[in-house]
Interface confidence: low
């Protein structure tokens, strides 16, 4: 069933690009599920965390809600306090 509104990761795209520090964790969690090997390597090749996150977000337009939930779950595991902070904002 369709869900109204933007997904959390789309709502907070700018903040996530700026504030996520543990991109490797996200890649591990998403690899083989929503990220291909080529995409995984492309994100890892970026020099900074913000550029890694920008590259990761370049793939999300093709993801459905469930795929985005996987990213949110990985974020909750790696930087739970960041997710909680954004949920309050």
């Amino acid at each position: 069933a369709a869900k109204p509104g933007l997904h959390f990761i789309d709502q907070h795209r700018a903040a996530l690009i700026a504030r996520v520090t543990n991109v490797e964790w996200l890649l591990d969690a998403l690899y083989g599920k929503v990220l291909t090997d080529e995409q995984y390597q492309a994100v890892r090749a970026e020099p900074t965390n913000p550029s890694k996150m920008r590259k990761l977000f370049s793939f999300t337009p093709a993801w459905n809600w469930t795929c985005k939930d996987l990213l949110l779950q990985a974020l909750r595991e790696s930087q739970s306090y960041l997710v909680e902070d954004l949920e309050r904002s």
Partner: nanobody
Framework: QLQLVESGGGLVQPGGSLKLSCAAS????????MSWYRQAPGKERESVAR????????YYADSVKGRFTISREDAKNTVYLQMNSLKPEDTAVYYC?????WGQGTQVTVSS
């Protein structure tokens, strides 16, 4: 009940070393990635190092690469953080983390 207990913190001079330990219980340790985070006064908690289950994937924050080493001993349900060439900016409370759970933290102070 899941429990994470850190130890090994203390006061050390710049250039010195410390080895932190995190003893885990209440879950199947070998199946989970384990992480170390730190939080300095007035700053956001930041990721320091992470080791995957099996130890095949290791991540380090840029600020500690080449100085810190994370390792795990599944037989002892323990993850370690060996910290060498410590700097004053490494002063923080260091936390062990797994899947939404945090330890109580151990204070590391680097000062002459």
């Amino acid at each position: 009940q899941l429990q994470l207990v850190e130890s090994g913190g203390g006061l050390v001079q710049p250039g010195g070393s410390l080895k932190l330990s995190c003893a885990a219980s209440g879950f199947t340790f070998s199946r989970y990635a384990m992480s170390w985070y730190r939080q300095a006064p007035g700053k956001e908690r930041e990721s320091v190092a992470r080791i995957s289950s099996g130890g095949g994937t290791i991540y380090y924050a840029d600020s500690v690469k080449g100085r810190f080493t994370i390792s795990r001993e599944d037989a002892k349900n323990t993850v370690y953080l060996q910290m060498n060439s410590l700097k004053p900016e490494d002063t923080a409370v260091y936390y062990c983390y797994v899947g939404g759970f945090w330890g109580q933290g151990t204070q590391v102070t680097v000062s002459s």
